[in-house]
Interface confidence: low
């Protein structure tokens, strides 16, 4: 049963945000119209992110199942580019609104996502 009729505008929701085994940070968002995913780096503990990060790979996924009526976009960045502690923001937005997810980033340590979003 579709939760959203095709063409109904919906604010992006971030479906997954993960650190992959190859060191990539990946963010997957769904919404209508198709969300844009932008990446930002915030030095230190500040969550005011201004330095834009160029994604290494972006694709629109074919979604035959949930979330119905939404377009799903996957974007990845290469974490090896970061040399300082800080936070990485994945921001998904479209004409309706925006949603962000954050990764804590510690140089030469593991990256783990915050388990909260900013809307």
């Amino acid at each position: 049963q579709p939760s959203v009729s095709p063409g109904e505008n919906t604010k992006p929701e971030i479906l997954t945000y993960d650190r992959l085994v190859n060191g990539m940070l990946q963010c997957v968002a769904a919404g209508f119209p198709e969300p844009t995913i932008d990446w930002y780096f915030c030095p230190g503990t500040e969550q005011r992110c201004s330095a834009s990060v160029l994604p290494v790979d972006v694709q629109t996924l074919n979604s035959s199942g949930p979330p119905f009526g939404k377009l799903v976009v996957q974007s990845s960045i290469d974490s090896s580019a970061f040399k300082h502690n800080g936070t990485v923001e994945c921001k998904a937005y479209n004409d309706v609104g925006k949603t962000s997810a954050y990764f804590n980033f510690a140089f030469k340590e593991q990256i783990h996502p915050h388990h909260h979003h900013h809307h």
């Epitope: 190859n22 990539m24 198709e34 160029l54 994604p55 290494v56 790979d57 972006v58 629109t60 290469d78």
Partner: antibody
Framework: EVQLLESGGGLVQPGGSLRLSCAAS????????MQWVRQAPGKGLEWVSS????????QYADSVKGRFTISRDNSKNTLYLQMNSLRAEDTAVYYC??????????WGQGTMVTVSS | DIQMTQSPGTLSLSPGERATLSCRAS???????LAWYQQKPGQAPRLLIY???TRATGIPDRFSGSGSGTDFTLTISRLEPEDFAVYYC???????????FGQGTKLEIK
């Protein structure tokens, strides 16, 4: 140092074939979308083809669709462009470039392909 | 398909002057996917700006990008001798996936 180095260009007759290679170094090749872009003598840039990091999805400009095939070998850090049924209008410098849909951030120096009888 | 038109075709200016290069799309698109490149004779293109206004790594702050919808601008605030080159804008369209370059603007010394 991040680097892309094209090879395989040369002179070929119309209807002939050529295979271009692009050797990547200094970055994790298998993580990146890659593309071929060409530039005819004295003309502007024209996107030719793109391939996703895994190689599972490819895109082509209409002008080369059905004649050119992009591929990659992530174990060799190498990108390829197989060009068949070549035409005079395919004469150009062919660049490989790294990047995503946002932009192409690293380019090779190019390899010249001349199609002439 | 979206067409990208750059103007002027040639721009003649002197070092120290301000350069304004225009790129117009035949239809509106997502501004995240507008980039600018610089190309000098015999060299490969170099990425200057992506996402309409973000400078690529190592690009001096005299280069700036702006715009939205169909009209985009590359501005070089104070021309240096090494800035004289050809500049291309580039757009990405996702349906079908393809990349479109403008025809280029040649920035030459007056």
């Amino acid at each position: 140092e991040v680097q892309l180095l094209e090879s395989g260009g040369g002179l070929v007759q119309p209807g002939g074939s050529l295979r271009l290679s692009c050797a990547a170094s200094g970055f994790t090749f298998s993580n990146y979308q890659m593309q071929w872009v060409r530039q005819a003598p004295g003309k502007g840039l024209e996107w030719v083809s793109s391939i996703r990091p895994s190689g599972g999805s490819t895109q082509y400009a209409d002008s080369v669709k059905g004649r050119f095939t992009i591929s990659r070998d992530n174990s060799k850090n190498t990108l390829y462009l197989q060009m068949n049924s070549l035409r005079a209008e395919d004469t150009a410098v062919y660049y490989c470039a790294r990047g995503s849909s946002h932009a192409f951030d690293i380019w090779g120096q190019g390899t010249m392909v001349t199609v002439s009888s | 398909d979206i067409q990208m038109t750059q103007s002027p075709g040639t721009l003649s200016l002197s070092p120290g002057e301000r350069a304004t290069l225009s790129c117009r799309a035949s239809q509106s698109f997502r501004s995240s996917y507008l980039a600018w490149y610089q190309q000098k004779p015999g060299q490969a293109p170099r990425l200057l700006i992506y996402d309409t206004s973000t400078r690529a790594t190592g690009i001096p702050d005299r280069f700036s990008g702006s715009g939205s919808g169909t009209d985009f601008t590359l501005t070089i605030s104070r021309l240096e001798p090494e800035d004289f080159a050809v500049y291309y804008c580039q757009q990405y369209g996702s349906s079908p996936p393809m990349y479109t370059f403008g025809q280029g603007t040649k920035l030459e010394i007056k």
